[in-house]
Interface confidence: low
C-alpha cells in the first residue's frame, strides 16, 4: 500500500520506542566507528522529524523515502571523511546507489575494542541511574560490532537484557544472578548474528532464488502438514523480511516480521500444531519463538515421491512449464519427509534432480534417462552421515578443547594463508559442533551439525572476503553455497605453501597469561598451535601434541612460581629451543 509519508507510516506502526531503537541500530550498523552520543543525537533528530510527519503527512520532506531521509542524516556527520575514508564518497551518490554504497562498506570485523564487562555493582548503578541510556548503549555496541544482526531480534535481546538487570540488580547475590544470564545472552547473540550473516550472504552473494530454496526446505521440514501453497506464501513473506533487514531497511523489516508472525498465528491450523504456545506470547517473544519452533509431526500417510517425480509421464512437461515451481514442489515434498536431513543436503538433492531433468528432458527417451535419479542421491546422503559419525567419535574421544585443536591443525594445513586470529576463531566454532550436536540422536544429528557448519564456514568466508589471501578459500566460498562444507572437507594439505619464518617473539609468553580466564588461556595456546603449524606444516600429530603438552606444563609451572615473569623468560627460552629441536625447525 502506498503511503503519503513512509516515515510517518512506520512510526505509527512500530511505536516510538521501537522506531527509535531500530533507527539507532540502523545508524550504528552503517557508521560503526561513530561515538554513541553522535548516534543518539541523529536518532533524536530523525524521531522529531517523524513526529512532524505523523502530525501532517504533507509537511515538507515527509514524502521522501526512508533511504533518502536516513542517508541525508548520516551524511551530515562532520568527521565522515576522517573516520571512514572512502565511505564518505557514498554521500556524493543519489539513492538507491548511496544506500548500496553504505551497505558495501559494512565491516564484519571492525577495528573496535573488545567489550569488557564492568563490575556488577558498576553496571547496576548505571542501569538504575539511566535505564534508557543503558539499554540504548547495549543496542549500539552490539549493532556496530555485528552490522548484519537481525534488527527485530536485537530488540528481543535488549528486552531480555533489561529483564536480567531489573531482576538481578535487586537480588541478594547480584553477580550469581546476573553473570550467567549475561553469558547466555552473549553466546546466543553471537550465534544469532552468525545465523543472520549467512542469510544475508545467501541473498547478497547467491540471490533471492538461493534464499527461497533454503526457506522452502527449512519451512517444509518445520511445517510438514502445511500445503505447498501455504509454504510458498510463508517463503515469499520471509524472503521479503530478510531482504529488507539485510538491505538496511530495518523499519520495514520489523514491521513485516510482525505482520508475518500475526499471519502465522491467525493461520496456525493450516500451518503447524506446535505454534500454540508461541502465539500466546507478546510480539517480540512470539516472533522469536516461531523462528525457533520445533518441527511438527509428519503426516502419517505421505505417498512415495517417485510417483510424481520419477514415474509420472508428465515430469518433463511439468518441469518445462514452471521449472522453479516444480523444483520448489520437489524440495517441499522431499524436505517434509526428511527432518533428519540438513537443509544443505536437501538443496544438493534438489540441484541433482534439476541437473538430471535438464539433461534428460532433452534426451530421446527422457523417462529412461531419469528413471534412476533417486539412486544418485545415495552417495550425497552418505557423505555427511559418515563425516558426522567420524567427527562425533573423535569429539567423544577428545573432548571439546582437544577436538578444537584437531580442527585447528586440520584447517591450518588446508588454508595456512588465512590469518591466525581467523583460523582460531573459526576452528573453535567448528569444534563447538561436537557439544552442540553429537549429544543428539541420529535423526537430529545431521540437521544440527551440517547446518551449523554452514553458519561457521560463512564466518570464514565473510572474514576472508575482506582481505582475500587464499584462492582455495575464495573458490570454496564462491562456487556453491550448498557445497561449501564438502568443498572445505575435500581440501588436503596445501603443498604450495611456503612455511612461515620462525619468530621466537610469537612464542614468548608473560605472567599476564596466569590471570586470564580459562577460555582466554585456551585461545593463547591455540594461537601458538596455529603458528606452530604455519612454521611446520608437515609436523605430525604426535610432534604437535608433544610440543603442546610441554607448553601446557610450562604455563602451569610458571603460573605457580613465586617469580612468574622470570620463570616465563627463562623456561620460555628452553621451551622454544626444545620445540625447535622436536619439530626440526
Amino acid at each position: 500500500d502506498a503511503h503519503k509519508s513512509e516515515v510517518a507510516h512506520r512510526f505509527k506502526d512500530l511505536g516510538e520506542e521501537n522506531f527509535k531503537a531500530l533507527v539507532l541500530i540502523a545508524f550504528a550498523q552503517y557508521l560503526q566507528q561513530c561515538p554513541f552520543e553522535d548516534h543518539v543525537k541523529l536518532v533524536n533528530e530523525v524521531t522529531e522529524f517523524a513526529k512532524t510527519c505523523v502530525a501532517d503527512e504533507s509537511a515538507e520532506n515527509c514524502d521522501k523515502s526512508l533511504h533518502t531521509l536516513f542517508g541525508d542524516k548520516l551524511c551530515t556527520v562532520a568527521t565522515l571523511r576522517e573516520t571512514y575514508g572512502e565511505m564518505a564518497d557514498c554521500c556524493a551518490k543519489q539513492e538507491p546507489e548511496r544506500n548500496e554504497c553504505f551497505l558495501q562498506h559494512k565491516d564484519d570485523n571492525p577495528n573496535l575494542p573488545r567489550l569488557v564487562r564492568p563490575e556488577v555493582d558498576v553496571m547496576c548503578t548505571a542501569f538504575h541511574d539511566n535505564e534508557e541510556t543503558f539499554l540504548k548503549k547495549y543496542l549500539y555496541e552490539i549493532a556496530r560490532r555485528h552490522p548484519y544482526f537481525y534488527a527485530p531480534e536485537l530488540l528481543f535481546f535488549a528486552k531480555r537484557y533489561k529483564a536480567a538487570f531489573t531482576e538481578c540488580c535487586q537480588a541478594a547475590d547480584k553477580a550469581a544472578c546476573l553473570l550467567p544470564k549475561l553469558d547466555e545472552l552473549r553466546d546466543e547473540g553471537k550465534a544469532s548474528s552468525a545465523k543472520q550473516r549467512l542469510k544475508c550472504a545467501s541473498l547478497q552473494k547467491f540471490g533471492e532464488r538461493a534464499f527461497k530454496a533454503w526457506a522452502v526446505a527449512r519451512l517444509s521440514q518445520r511445517f510438514p502438514k502445511a500445503e505447498f501453497a501455504e509454504v510458498s506464501k510463508l517463503v515469499t513473506d520471509l524472503t521479503k523480511v530478510h531482504t529488507e533487514c539485510c538491505h538496511g531497511d530495518l523499519l520495514e523489516c520489523a514491521d513485516d516480521r510482525a505482520d508475518l508472525a500475526k499471519y502465522i498465528c491467525e493461520n496456525q491450523d493450516s500451518i503447524s500444531s506446535k505454534l500454540k504456545e508461541c502465539c500466546e506470547k507478546p510480539l517480540l517473544e512470539k516472533s522469536h519463538c516461531i523462528a525457533e519452533v520445533e518441527n511438527d509431526e509428519m503426516p502419517a500417510d505421505l505417498p512415495s515421491l517417485a510417483a510424481d517425480f520419477v514415474e509420472s509421464k508428465d515430469v518433463c512437461k511439468n518441469y518445462a512449464e514452471a521449472k522453479d515451481v516444480f523444483l520448489g514442489m520437489f524440495l517441499y515434498e522431499y524436505a517434509r519427509r526428511h527432518p533428519d536431513y540438513s537443509v544443505v543436503l536437501l538443496l544438493r538433492l534438489a540441484k541433482t534432480y534439476e541437473t538430471t531433468l535438464e539433461k534428460c528432458c532433452a534426451a530421446a527417451d527422457p523417462h529412461e534417462c531419469y528413471a534412476k535419479v533417486f539412486d544418485e542421491f545415495k552417495p550425497l546422503v552418505e557423505e555427511p552421515q559418515n563425516l558426522i559419525k567420524q567427527n562425533c567419535e573423535l569429539f567423544e574421544q577428545l573432548g571439546e578443547y582437544k577436538f578444537q585443536n584437531a580442527l585447528l591443525v586440520r584447517y591450518t594445513k588446508k588454508v595456512p594463508q588465512v590469518s591466525t586470529p581467523t583460523l582460531v576463531e573459526v576452528s573453535r566454532n567448528l569444534g563447538k559442533v561436537g557439544s552442540k550436536c553429537c549429544k543428539h540422536p541420529e535423526a537430529k544429528r545431521m540437521p544440527c551439525a551440517e547446518d551449523y557448519l554452514s553458519v561457521v564456514l560463512n564466518q570464514l568466508c565473510v572474514l576472508h572476503e575482506k582481505t582475500p589471501v587464499s584462492d582455495r578459500v575464495t573458490k570454496c566460498c564462491t562456487e556453491s553455497l550448498v557445497n561449501r562444507r564438502p568443498c572445505f572437507s575435500a581440501l588436503e594439505v596445501d603443498e604450495t605453501y611456503v612455511p612461515k619464518e620462525f619468530n621466537a617473539e610469537t612464542f614468548t609468553f608473560h605472567a599476564d597469561i596466569c590471570t586470564l580466564s580459562e577460555k582466554e588461556r585456551q585461545i593463547k595456546k591455540q594461537t601458538a598451535l596455529v603458528e606452530l603449524v604455519k612454521h611446520k606444516p608437515k609436523a605430525t600429530k604426535e610432534q604437535l601434541k608433544a610440543v603442546m603438552d610441554d607448553f601446557a606444563a610450562f604455563v602451569e609451572k610458571c603460573c605457580k612460581a613465586d617469580d612468574k615473569e622470570t620463570c616465563f623468560a627463562e623456561e620460555g627460552k628452553k621451551l622454544v629451543a626444545a620445540s625447535q629441536a622436536a619439530l626440526g625447525l
Partner: nanobody, 115 residues
Framework: QVQLQESGGGLVQPGGSLRLSCVAS????????MGWYRQAPGKQRELVAS???????HYADTVKGRFTISKDNAANMVYLQMNALEPEDTAVYYC?????????WGQGTQVTVSS
C-alpha cells in the same frame, strides 16, 4: 509458462453489474495470492481486491461493499463480482496470481461505466 486470461469486461451503465473471470493456464502450483488491479488512463495501477491462500480478502476503500472477490482453487480461477458500478470504476482490469515461482499478470480487460 503460466498464462492468465481475463474475461467479462465491457460497457455498462452506472449502477449496473459485471463479473470478471481470470483463468490460469499451464502448470501453476502453490498459488498463495490472487488479485485484481486496475489502471485508469493517466493513473497508476492500483489494487482493487485480493484473496490469499487462507481465503482472507482485502479491498480498496473505494470498492468496499460493492465488489466481491472469490476463487476456485481446483480450476485456478479468480472472479470479481462488481455491483453498483460508477463512472470512476472505468479502467483496464488486470488479474494477478502469485506463487513461489513468481508474479503472473494477465493482459487486462476493459471495463467502461458510462450512460
Amino acid at each position: 509458462q503460466v498464462q492468465l486470461q481475463e474475461s467479462g469486461g465491457g460497457l455498462v451503465q452506472p449502477g449496473g453489474s459485471l463479473r470478471l473471470s481470470c483463468v490460469a493456464s499451464g502448470s501453476i502450483w502453490g498459488i498463495y495470492h490472487m488479485g485484481w488491479y486496475r489502471q485508469a488512463p493517466g493513473k497508476q495501477r492500483e489494487l482493487v481486491a485480493s484473496i490469499t491462500v487462507d481465503g482472507s480478502t482485502h479491498y480498496a476503500d473505494t470498492v468496499k461493499g460493492r465488489f466481491t472477490i472469490s476463487k476456485d482453487n481446483a480450476a485456478n480461477m479468480v472472479y470479481l463480482q462488481m455491483n453498483a458500478l460508477e463512472p470512476e470504476d472505468t479502467a483496464v482490469y488486470y488479474c494477478d496470481i502469485r506463487n513461489v515461482g513468481g508474479d503472473y499478470w494477465g493482459q487486462g480487460t476493459q471495463v467502461t461505466v458510462s450512460s
